[in-house]
């Protein structure tokens, strides 16, 4: 019956001897065998492992392509990639932030209800009655209509989404 | 006895495809990456492109990046490389190497040869 | 690329000692190995990580240097060792391999 080798989490199996892996920042140049450890060696400038591993070539960082909106957010080191993220105005579409688009304004008649951010677009809403939003903007939310009593005068002209109401003298009672 | 055969070198036309299986044995195949290095007839060695264990990552030459396709099969204990779109310029003896950072084993070797 | 220049012929006697040396354009570290090949027959590896001696070849030959020198000494040459010596690198992508080194005996 074959023996059943159990290696710990440091160490893999390798032709039926544990042998231990290359930790994060390095990659294996040379398997163990019975006379020799497992021999490891950094990563070089530009490259990195993040695990514990026994691949022959570590990863390559990462390049955070302007041309696609994207810019470093954290430099990469032997141990960890680098982290792009997007460029002033614009927010990453996926998870990994392979890209970037255009933050989305609320148009006229929907006001900001979350501001974008450098992982998601704005939130708009339409304005509900008694509020408006009479422009495009990333962040200006919906504005309550003018409270044309409060001034002691009266609507000319009913409030929309887009609009504000149009107060005027009250006209006196002949 | 670890061993490498390679098989199904020949004569083929420019622009045409060729696919050279290696066959393992005496070893855990899965144990190791896997390379194919050629050598141009009366010229030095050139690595050609190398898998990883399992085959999720591989790596090429830049002058068979797009044309050459490396692959192994784990359970067959066998190494693929798929050439396409050939070249005169790919006309050589093809290894196949199980390497860590160095090449230990070697096959015989198969000669390819690019002409119309 | 690392390119890795090897001169490409010596001769020697038997029983004498010959360095074969390899240069790279850009350091490698350590990560420089060493093959033989006889005509006909594929490369067999001699020397890996610029020192170490594969298993069940000659202790007459040996290897040392970093970063952009090495040499592979064999020491005594014997007529068998009439071959091409080849260095290769894997520090840096691609992998490279020197032009060979063909050794003759007088």
């Known amino acids: 019956l074959g023996q059943c080798v159990t290696c710990s989490d440091k160490q893999y199996l390798h032709d039926g001897q544990c042998c231990d892996l290359c930790q994060p920042g390095s990659r294996l140049t040379s398997h163990c065998t019975a006379l020799e450890k497992t021999q490891c060696h950094p990563c070089d400038s530009g490259e990195f492992s993040a695990q514990w591993n026994r691949e022959i070539r570590c990863h390559q960082h990462r390049h955070c392509e302007p041309n696609q909106g994207l810019r470093v957010k954290k430099e990469g080191t032997a141990e960890s990639d680098t982290v792009c993220t997007c460029k002033e105005g614009q927010h990453c579409t996926s998870k990994d932030c392979e890209a970037c688009a255009q933050h989305t304004p609320c148009i006229p008649g929907f006001g900001v209800m979350e501001m974008a951010t450098e992982t998601t677009d704005t939130v708009c809403h339409p304005c509900p009655v008694g509020f408006f939003s009479n422009q495009s903007s990333l962040f200006e939310k919906c504005y309550p209509w003018t409270s044309c009593e409060d001034k002691n005068l009266e609507v000319l002209q009913k409030g929309t989404s887009q609009t504000n109401v149009i107060c005027g003298l009250k006209s006196r009672m002949r | 006895e670890v061993q490498l055969v390679e098989s199904d070198g020949g004569l083929v036309q420019p622009g045409r495809s060729l696919k050279l299986p290696c066959a393992a044995s005496?070893?855990?195949?899965?144990?190791?990456?896997m390379a194919w290095v050629r050598q141009a007839p009366t010229k030095g060695l050139e690595w050609v492109a190398s898998?990883?264990?399992?085959?999720?990552?591989?790596y090429y030459r830049d002058s068979v990046k797009g044309r050459f396709t490396i692959s192994r099969d784990n359970a067959k204990s066998t190494l693929y490389l798929q050439m396409d779109s050939l070249r005169s310029e790919d006309t050589a003896t093809y290894y196949c190497?199980?390497?860590?950072?160095?090449?230990?084993?070697w096959g015989q070797g198969v000669m390819v040869t690019v002409s119309s | 690329d690392t390119v890795l220049t090897q001169s490409p012929a010596l001769a020697v006697s038997p029983g004498e000692r010959v360095t074969i040396s390899c240069r790279a354009s850009?350091?490698?570290?350590?990560?420089m190995h060493w093959y033989q090949q006889k005509p006909g027959q594929q490369p067999k590896l001699l020397i890996y990580?610029?020192?170490h001696l594969e298993s069940g070849v000659p202790a007459r030959f040996s290897g040392s240097g970093s970063g952009t020198d090495f040499t592979l000494t064999i020491d005594p040459v014997e007529a068998d060792d009439t071959a091409t010596y080849y260095c290769?690198?894997?520090?840096?992508?691609?992998?490279?391999f020197g032009g060979g080194t063909k050794l003759e005996l007088k």
């Open positions: 190497g199980r390497h860590s950072s160095y090449f230990d084993y």
């Open positions: 290769q690198q894997s520090w840096n992508d691609p992998w490279t």
């Open positions: 850009d350091s490698v570290s350590t990560l």
């Open positions: 990580l610029a020192s």
């Open positions: 898998i990883s264990y399992d085959g999720s990552s591989t």
């Open positions: 005496g070893f855990t195949f899965s144990d190791y990456y």
